[in-house]
Interface confidence: medium
């Protein structure tokens, strides 16, 4: 099993059987009357993993997911029949697939489901303290889920709940055609993206939403949506998908005369993840699948990890690209995409940009406007017709940090852990695939910090049957990884140091930042331990220097 080969060959390849036998995976194989364990909410404080599934919401113990509580939340036979009458599949569509599961306050979660093509939301009581052991549905308080959850369980939703307001990227209609980014709940009127305007959103598939501070002034906070969508006509010859990052100001309350109850600060930019190909033609990984934000030191500047796949059916490939928020902000401060008519090319807008610059949040920091409702008409008019930026966001170092093209699987999910090792800090990526495997990859700086080498440490099969991984969460407290799929939920430790072998050289060659030779075994490395007794070399994996004495 242990291999010391090229970087694209895993150091360790573990089958599901081997994972079980070595006590490296705990699986919850689902309930007979449920499926689709896709919606995760990690609560480190309570030591719980909340999972939304078909007709159920689970609360798993982070220590061992075999210990769980469940809420049954099906649809009434009325809704089920109505859905069936609409020609939908009774098992795959006419049920309550949980799509939104967020912390609402200290004592409640907010959950939304498809409700058999009749979206519905409610609150879940979880108590003040973990020891309260409360996990129950607020049966008396159901809300319309339109604009929060899609009708169709096959559709993706991205959501974020902050300060009692829910931001959702979803489809707001039965047919799955009216896609929008919404803000609902709270005391204000719901806000959404412009309807039926492909310049704003063009059949998007939403991935995730994140709050990122722009400055020390909370008035400048922005919500960023990651999604993929059809390229706008003229932007690309033929039908193509583009990966996108969209921004919205948290304090956007829509326009006064125009864009009433619509976002006035919405902007989007393309995310590029490509490799130079032969004949100077780049190979693009455009199908954004997942995003992970690595917050470290400065919450205003997280590193964005994106998982991408190719659009082509002929050439199957996956990649991971990293983006810096400074590059993202630079693009949003750059030229807007403009064209004079449907048959014209998109060009950078050269005219006068109205003040305050569209996309700027109303605050004391960047201008004298207290509210988006006070924005001048020319700003609103410009914002309505110029939602896209001309320049794309390029990845750090202008290329992916991980590429896989010669395999029978594609990447679906990513989580990243920053690990302290003997010779510095390393980002360890856990990448989920569409065949139920998890790749553990470390990116190692070469000469410069941004010039990275990828080392594939492990390839682990975490489900009995090949099934696409659709959700992943990492608990730094528990040092565990939690994985969701249609079939169930799996839990595995972030490290399996003992499996690397019984000798110092093997441990050192593994180049796993979690592991070091302690003199007698390959075990978990803790930076606080005495340096002399720990043998580890992540950067070079050189056993001669570290294991010779």
């Amino acid at each position: 099993n242990y291999q010391n080969g090229k970087n694209n060959v895993p150091r360790l390849k573990l089958s599901y059987k081997e994972m079980l036998e070595s006590n490296n995976v705990i699986t919850f194989n689902g309930l007979a009357n449920s499926s689709s364990y896709h919606t995760f909410l990690l609560d480190e404080e309570r030591s719980r993993l909340y999972v939304g599934a078909k007709d159920h919401i689970f609360s798993f113990d982070l220590v061992n997911i075999k210990d769980f509580q469940k809420i049954v939340w099906p649809v009434s036979y009325t809704r089920r029949d109505e859905c069936k009458w609409a020609g939908k599949d009774i098992l795959k569509e006419c049920a309550n697939f949980i799509k939104v599961l967020k912390a609402y306050n200290q004592t409640h979660l907010y959950a939304c489901g498809t409700g058999a093509f009749h979206p519905i939301c409610t609150y879940i009581e979880i108590g003040h303290h973990p020891e309260d052991n409360i996990f129950k549905l607020e049966n008396s308080h159901f809300e319309n889920g339109r604009g929060k959850s899609p009708y169709d369980p096959k559709l993706l939703t991205a959501s974020l709940l902050i300060d009692g307001e829910l931001y959702s990227g979803t489809a707001a209609d039965f047919m799955g055609r009216d896609f929008a980014i919404f803000r609902t709940l709270g005391h204000h009127h719901p806000i959404r993206t412009e309807q039926h305007d492909s310049r704003w959103l063009n059949d998007p598939k939403f991935i995730s939403a994140h709050l990122i501070s722009e400055s020390d002034n909370p008035e400048d906070d922005k919500v960023y949506f990651f999604f993929r969508e059809n390229a706008i006509d003229g932007e690309h010859s033929g039908k193509a998908t583009h990966a996108r990052i969209g921004q919205i100001c948290k304090n956007d309350f829509g326009g006064h005369r125009s864009l009433v109850n619509k976002w006035t600060t919405f902007l989007k930019a393309r995310l590029i993840c490509s490799v130079p190909g032969p004949n100077g033609i780049d190979t693009h990984f455009d199908e954004l699948q997942d995003v992970f934000l690595m917050n470290f030191k400065d919450p205003k500047n997280p590193v964005v990890y994106g998982v991408f796949t190719t659009s082509s059916n002929i050439f199957k490939g996956s990649a991971v690209c990293m983006y810096s928020m400074s590059d993202v902000r630079r693009v949003f401060l750059g030229p807007y995409a403009h064209r004079d008519g449907p048959n014209y090319q998109w060009v950078p807008y050269q005219g006068r940009v109205p003040y305050p610059r569209p996309g700027t949040c109303p605050s004391k920091t960047f201008g004298g406007f207290d509210s988006t409702k006070d924005l001048p008409d020319d700003v609103i008019t410009f914002a309505r017709s110029h939602p896209a930026m001309y320049n794309p966001v390029f990845p750090m170092n202008n290329r992916p940090i991980v590429i896989k093209t010669d395999v029978n699987y594609q990447f679906t999910q990513i989580v990243v852990d920053r690990v302290d090792a003997e010779d510095g800090q390393y980002d360890v990526m856990f990448i989920g695939t569409d065949v139920g495997t998890v790749l553990k990859v470390v990116s190692i700086p070469k000469e410069t910090w941004y010039d990275l080498e990828e080392v594939l440490l492990e390839e682990m099969t975490v489900f009995r049957e090949p099934t696409a991984i659709s959700a992943m969460e990492l608990s730094t407290k528990q040092q565990q990884l939690y994985i969701g799929s249609t079939a169930g939920v799996a839990q595995l430790p972030l490290h399996r140091c003992d499996i690397y072998g019984k000798a110092c050289a093997e441990c050192c060659l593994a180049r796993d930042p979690y592991c070091a030779w302690d003199g007698s075994a390959c075990s978990r490395y803790f930076p606080t331990a005495k340096r002399r007794t720990r043998r580890q070399d992540i950067r070079n994996g050189d056993p001669l220097t570290h294991c010779s004495d």
């Epitope: 036979y77 089920r80 029949d81 109505e82 069936k84 009458w85 339109r146 209609d173």
Partner: antibody
Framework: EVQLLESGGGLVQTGGSLRLSCAAS????????MSWVRQAPGKGLEWVSW????????YYADSVKGRFTISRDNSKNTLYLQMNSLRAEDTAVYYC?????????WGQGTLVTVSS | QSVLTQPPSASGTPGQRVTISCSGS????????VSWYQQLPGTAPKLLIY???HRPSGVPDRFSGSKSGTSASLAISGLRSEDEADYYC???????????FGGGTKLTVL
């Protein structure tokens, strides 16, 4: 108390048009699918059409497809049936019914007579 | 010709038990819930039984529904004169993508 009140029926020539309305009260109209069912004089019940709670989906019996259009205005708690190209066999009492996995509440009906 | 088949008439004396049958196919009764409706003379239909055997509130427990395979039946025990009405069975038909009714059964209380 749930109430459904149909209106708009009457005598019309073959090939003519009529628009039926159904005013709903006593329940959250926007939460339920609604339907039209008809009954020809001395005959049994025949389902005509139904509409999803948010107008997202509409369904018709083969006998009226292409001629009848169901719609609703949730802000007015009203269901409509636009009937075009009417035929003698469309003569019937038209009932508006609330859908709840079945037709759990019915209006009193409005008579539509199509004369040749 | 109705998709669901009911006997055109049925009768019974007060206090008696009467059963009305409704037969269909796998695309309607076989795989979907059956409802029963009562239509008193000169009035609109009223839901009597839903989901094969459930009674809405207000419907006396003298009325009961059952289903087996592609057939359903409505039983009325302790027959009363006010039960004299037309009774219709109904179900969603998956292959027709529409709701279908039986032709109706006229119940006479002798």
């Amino acid at each position: 108390e749930v109430q459904l009140l149909e209106s708009g029926g009457g005598l019309v020539q073959t090939g003519g048009s009529l628009r039926l309305s159904c005013a709903a009260s006593g329940f959250t109209f926007s939460d339920y699918a609604m339907s039209w069912v008809r009954q020809a004089p001395g005959k049994g019940l025949e389902w005509v059409s139904w509409i999803y709670y948010d107008s997202g989906s509409k369904y018709y019996a083969d006998s009226v497809k292409g001629r009848f259009t169901i719609s609703r205005d949730n802000s007015k708690n009203t269901l409509y049936l636009q009937m075009n190209s009417l035929r003698a066999e469309d003569t019937a009492v038209y009932y508006c019914a609330k859908l709840n996995g079945d037709f759990d509440y019915w209006g009193q009906g409005t008579l539509v007579t199509v004369s040749s | 010709q109705s998709v669901l088949t009911q006997p055109p008439s049925a009768s019974g004396t007060p206090g008696q038990r009467v059963t009305i049958s409704c037969s269909g196919s796998s695309s309607n009764i076989g795989n979907n819930d059956v409802s029963w409706y009562q239509q008193l003379p000169g009035t609109a239909p009223k839901l009597l039984i839903y989901a094969d055997s459930h009674r809405p509130s207000g419907v006396p427990d003298r009325f009961s529904g059952s289903k087996s395979g592609t057939s359903a039946s409505l039983a009325i025990s302790g027959l009363r004169s006010e039960d004299e009405a037309d009774y219709y069975c109904g179900a969603w038909d998956s292959s027709l993508s529409g709701y279908v009714f039986g032709g109706g059964t006229k119940l006479t209380v002798l």
